[in-house]
Interface confidence: medium
Amino acid sequence: KLLQVSTIAMQQQEKLIQQERALLNFTEWKRSCALQMKYCQAFMQNSLSSAHNSSPCPNNWIQNRESCYYVSEIWSIWHTSQENCLKEGSTLLQIESKEEMDFITGSLRKIKGSYDYWVGLSQDGHSGRWLWQDGSSPSPGLLPAERSQSANQVCGYVKSNSLLSSNCSTWKYFICEKYALRSSV
């Protein structure tokens, strides 16, 4: 009888673990959807506001190819940085290539020197995978150096010509990115 009870208890515990896993997956999926939604809204907002503007990038933004970049002059934690960028119809910088990384680090050297700048990279709490804000994975050459020993959530930032990682709750400058307006001919 006792054995039967303990077997039932173990089965119930297993069920509970499975439900917790499902809930975690759902929460992650919901978070991902919310971010995707914000990302689309930012893109739409940018497209609409750009339509009323003749220059490819807004004032104080730097252009490189199809992108406009804004290097902040204030410090924020990572999440606030992302919110600040979204308010401007942009997202935190997503570095797609070594060429883009070189442009960013070269521009930063000219503008401000060797500070820390948040980019749109964060580490998934469960899998430990690095993800850009649109849900994509960075290319192998653009993974942050393992620098943070933080037990808290970890996010990516640029310093000098390196991509590094740090506790998302520390304050840093940040870089926003949005599409440059194509000039209509």
């Epitope: 902040s72 002059e73 204030i74 410090w75 924020s76 606030t80 308010k87």
Partner: nanobody, 117 residues
Framework: DVQLVESGGGSVQAGGSLRLSCAAS????????MAWSRQAPGKEREFVAR????????DYADSVKGRFTISRDNAKNTVYLQMNSLKPEDTAIYYC??????????WSQGTQVTVSS
């Protein structure tokens, strides 16, 4: 128009204390994070401390951790920087700033702090 006026700077011996104040007028600062930074002669301006709008979150440069304390009184629209155990390397012009993404240029005029050994 927003104005940030500082007070409390001056000269002090190493190991001494100073309390800087930054009073804002023309805007309620309770919605904004506030920061202190400093610039020593011939060096870049560096981050010193920051406090969230509600005052529940603070952050410090490693060089001042444990010695400096940032605080705010939203009713008085003022931010403070309590500086203890001052060192000669703390000598700089100290600035406060409203951390407003859309208006990043709200810096104070700066107040001189000189620490002699």
């Amino acid at each position: 128009d927003v104005q940030l006026v500082e007070s409390g700077g001056g000269s002090v011996q190493a190991g001494g204390s100073l309390r800087l104040s930054c009073a804002a007028s023309g805007r309620t600062i309770s919605n904004y994070d506030m920061a202190w930074s400093r610039q020593a002669p011939g060096k870049e301006r560096e981050f010193v401390a920051r406090i969230s709008g509600s005052g529940d979150r603070t952050d410090y440069a490693d060089s001042v951790k444990g010695r400096f304390t940032i605080s705010r009184d939203n009713a008085k629209n003022t931010v403070y920087l309590q500086m203890n155990s001052l060192k000669p390397e703390d000598t700089a012009i100290y600035y406060c700033q409203i951390q407003d993404f859309r208006s990043p240029d709200f810096w104070s005029q700066g107040t001189q702090v000189t620490v002699s050994s």
